[in-house]
């Protein structure tokens, strides 16, 4: 059985205010069973950016259909970028557990920074 890897190919993503940013994340295995969530930052302040199962994330959409059984692409799009959106974003795999899911593996992170405005 292949060990799960969380792939976030971009170390740095330069974005433009008002535009949509795509944060890429793919997994190399369907196991263990459990969701992939998106966060910004690490430690006590880690902020939930997207959770397919619960919550309201009006500016976030998924690139692929996460309900498909064999989906391995957990990339997201964040619309209407503002300066407040800068930071390092992590896709994180959780293993299904009871009563709560348990964090299993994190991607290396993608730093989102503001690029120069188009002239």
């Amino acid at each position: 059985e292949e060990e799960l890897q969380m792939i976030q190919p971009e170390k740095l993503l330069l974005v433009t205010v008002g535009k949509t940013a795509t944060l890429h994340c793919t997994v190399t295995s369907l196991l263990p069973v459990g969701p992939v969530l998106w966060f910004r930052g690490v430690g006590p302040g880690r902020e939930l950016i997207y959770n397919q199962k619960e919550g309201h994330f009006p500016r976030v959409t998924t690139v692929s259909d996460l309900t498909k059984r064999n989906n391995m692409d957990f990339s997201i799009r964040i619309s209407s970028i503002t300066p407040a959106d800068v930071g390092t974003y992590y896709c994180v795999k959780f293993r299904k557990g009871s009563p709560e899911n348990v964090e299993f593996k994190s991607g290396p992170g993608t730093e989102m920074a503001l690029g120069a405005k188009p002239s």
Epitope: L37, F39, G41, P44, G45, R46, E47, G87, E103
Partner: antibody
Framework: VQLVESGGGLVQPGGSLRLSCTAS????????MSWVRQAPGEGLEWVSA???????YYTDSVKGRFTISRDNSKNTLYLQMNSLRAEDTAIYYC???????????WGLGTLVTVSS | EIVLTQSPGTLSVSPGERVTLTCRAS??????IAWYQQKPGQAPRLLIY???SRATGIPGRFSGSGSGTEFTLTITSLQSEDFAVYYC??????????FGGGTKVEIK
């Protein structure tokens, strides 16, 4: 953003107390929340935090005695304090933690006094 | 644990003066420093983060600077409402998050 603490009071050494912090004005479940305390006439000391992923963090002096938890359905953060000591006497502030780990909003605090 | 040392402990100044407060870290913290203001009987208020970024609603007379292990908070023209205690906090290493001991800015 509003944070309102409650549950403070006078307790004897070795006793227990549960603090609550009710939040409004933001999507509570998405954000890290923290407790920071201030002993009378002293500076600020970070105590504990619960991240937006539900992970918990403690300063060494309270590990094993304090438990942080949250009820996202009630927009409420808790701090269960057991085996209280005189040195735990302080104003306990609830604070919202930003993604890069500083505190952007604070409650007014609740006073905990540990004395016999 | 990263230790933050603030100096001076107390500063006596007159309104209108320029004030510089210092915060030194026991190791490099990559500019991850925040500054807070606390008035008697009130909760702390965020002023500056990432060493030099002003928080929402903070007047332009407050500015932060520094890198490596030494950071400063400058108040260009002290107003009566600025007399308070000022704390620095490092947000580089979260195990644990630590504050400086504070600097009290009092009326001369």
């Amino acid at each position: 953003v509003q944070l309102v603490e409650s549950g403070g009071g006078l307790v004897q050494p070795g006793g227990s107390l549960r603090l609550s912090c009710t939040a409004s004005g933001f999507t509570f479940r998405n954000y890290g929340m923290s407790w920071v305390r201030q002993a009378p006439g002293e500076g600020l000391e970070w105590v504990s935090a619960s991240s937006g992923s539900g992970s918990t963090y403690y300063t060494d002096s309270v590990k094993g005695r304090f438990t942080i938890s949250r009820d996202n359905s009630k927009n409420t953060l808790y701090l269960q304090m057991n085996s209280l000591r005189a040195e735990d006497t302080a104003i306990y502030y609830c604070a919202k933690v930003t993604w890069n780990n500083f505190f952007d909003y604070w409650g007014l605090g609740t006073l905990v006094t540990v004395s016999s | 644990e990263i230790v933050l040392t603030q100096s001076p402990g107390t500063l006596s100044v007159s309104p209108g003066e320029r004030v510089t407060l210092t915060c030194r870290a026991s190791q490099g913290i990559a500019g991850k420093i925040a500054w807070y203001q606390q008035k008697p009987g009130q909760a702390p208020r965020l002023l500056i983060y990432d060493a030099s970024s002003r928080a929402t609603g903070i007047p332009g007379r407050f500015s932060g600077s520094g890198s490596g292990t030494e950071f400063t908070l400058t108040i260009t023209s002290l107003q009566s409402e600025d007399f308070a205690v000022y704390y620095c906090q490092q947000h580089y290493d979260w195990s644990p998050l630590t504050f400086g001991g504070g600097t009290k800015v009092e009326i001369k």
